[in-house]
């Protein structure tokens, strides 16, 4: 039985050209996290595997950095980065948990700076 829950940063905003940390946290389960996949809509961004460490998709290597922790840092943001991001936690023995984050990249300095995981 899957008892865990994924907490995410929810809906966040950031300024064009800036950086943002995407963060998810799995709680309420003793399941072992074997791998976390990060996806942007229909693109695999990165994978963090308990044994193999991080793999960043080559097409995102210049703008995606691993961490902190199981999170993902997006750099040099563009308006095209606006959209849904998913953290997919592969666990044993529970199975798969998925969290969703919506990022809005704003043209000007109207981005909110109160987001808990945002880089100033």
């Amino acid at each position: 039985m899957m008892t865990g829950t994924i907490e995410t940063t929810g809906n966040i905003s950031a300024e064009k050209g800036g950086s943002i940390i995407l963060q998810c946290h799995l709680s309420s389960t003793t399941a072992q996290v074997t791998q976390v996949n990060w996806e942007q809509q229909d693109q695999l961004l990165a994978i963090c595997n308990a044994d193999l460490g991080w793999h960043i998709s080559p097409s995102f290597k210049d703008r995606v950095a691993p961490g902190p922790g199981l999170g993902l840092t997006l750099q040099s943001l563009t308006v095209n980065d606006t959209g849904e991001y998913f953290c997919i936690y592969h666990t044993y023995p529970d199975g798969t948990y998925t969290g969703r984050i919506f990022l809005e990249v704003l043209e000007s300095s109207v981005a909110e700076h109160g987001a808990r995981f945002q880089i100033p």
Partner: antibody, heavy 118, light 107 residues
Framework: EVQLLESGGGLVQPGGSLRLSCAAS????????MHWVRQAPGKGLEWVAG????????SYADSVKGRFTISRDNSKNTLYLQMNSLRAEDTAVYYC???????????WGQGTLVTVSS | DIQMTQSPSSLSASVGDRVTITCRAS??????LNWYQQKPGKAPKLLIY???SLQSGVPSRFSGSGSGTDFTLTISSLQPEDFATYYC?????????FGGGTKVEIK
Amino acid sequence: EVQLLESGGGLVQPGGSLRLSCAASGFTFSSYSMHWVRQAPGKGLEWVAGIWSSGGTTSYADSVKGRFTISRDNSKNTLYLQMNSLRAEDTAVYYCARVPYGVWMDYWGQGTLVTVSS
Amino acid sequence: DIQMTQSPSSLSASVGDRVTITCRASQSISSYLNWYQQKPGKAPKLLIYAASSLQSGVPSRFSGSGSGTDFTLTISSLQPEDFATYYCQQSYSTPLTFGGGTKVEIK
């Protein structure tokens, strides 16, 4: 250098059993998911079974579920496929493959031929 | 199960030609799509993983694109050693499934 070497294939009668082995070298075997893929003569590729790095999670194609068992011995750097209740349609070359991150098969063995015939 | 449909099943081309092979999934698989090359009597070889990432050591004339349900493998300028059978494979969910293959033959 990464190497995967399958063995254990051969001729077996319908209803019989075989155990295939895949000896791995050149990488940290315990860190990788490993899969078996087969190819019937003149046909395409068919995934058979997979086992994740810890060995706790396994998965099978419907066509072999309940008859085949995938396992691994990380201390011996070896992957296994126990095949029971073999049928003529199981005749194929069986390949083992390394699967980093459970997503792509980056190294394959040379294959071992299993022939099920009376 | 996710079905993978490859087209064409075979094609004839000449050295230097641009060759395109397509693969369609029966449901969205994000970018969990890999391409393999197989020559007669040999094991498959990984060319492209995660839809568009070129495997180390594979010539840059091979490229992959697509996401969701529609994917493409392109060989920009066919070389003599590229005559082979090509397979797509989804790793979005088990059971993992392969396309039926595309045989690239010499015209």
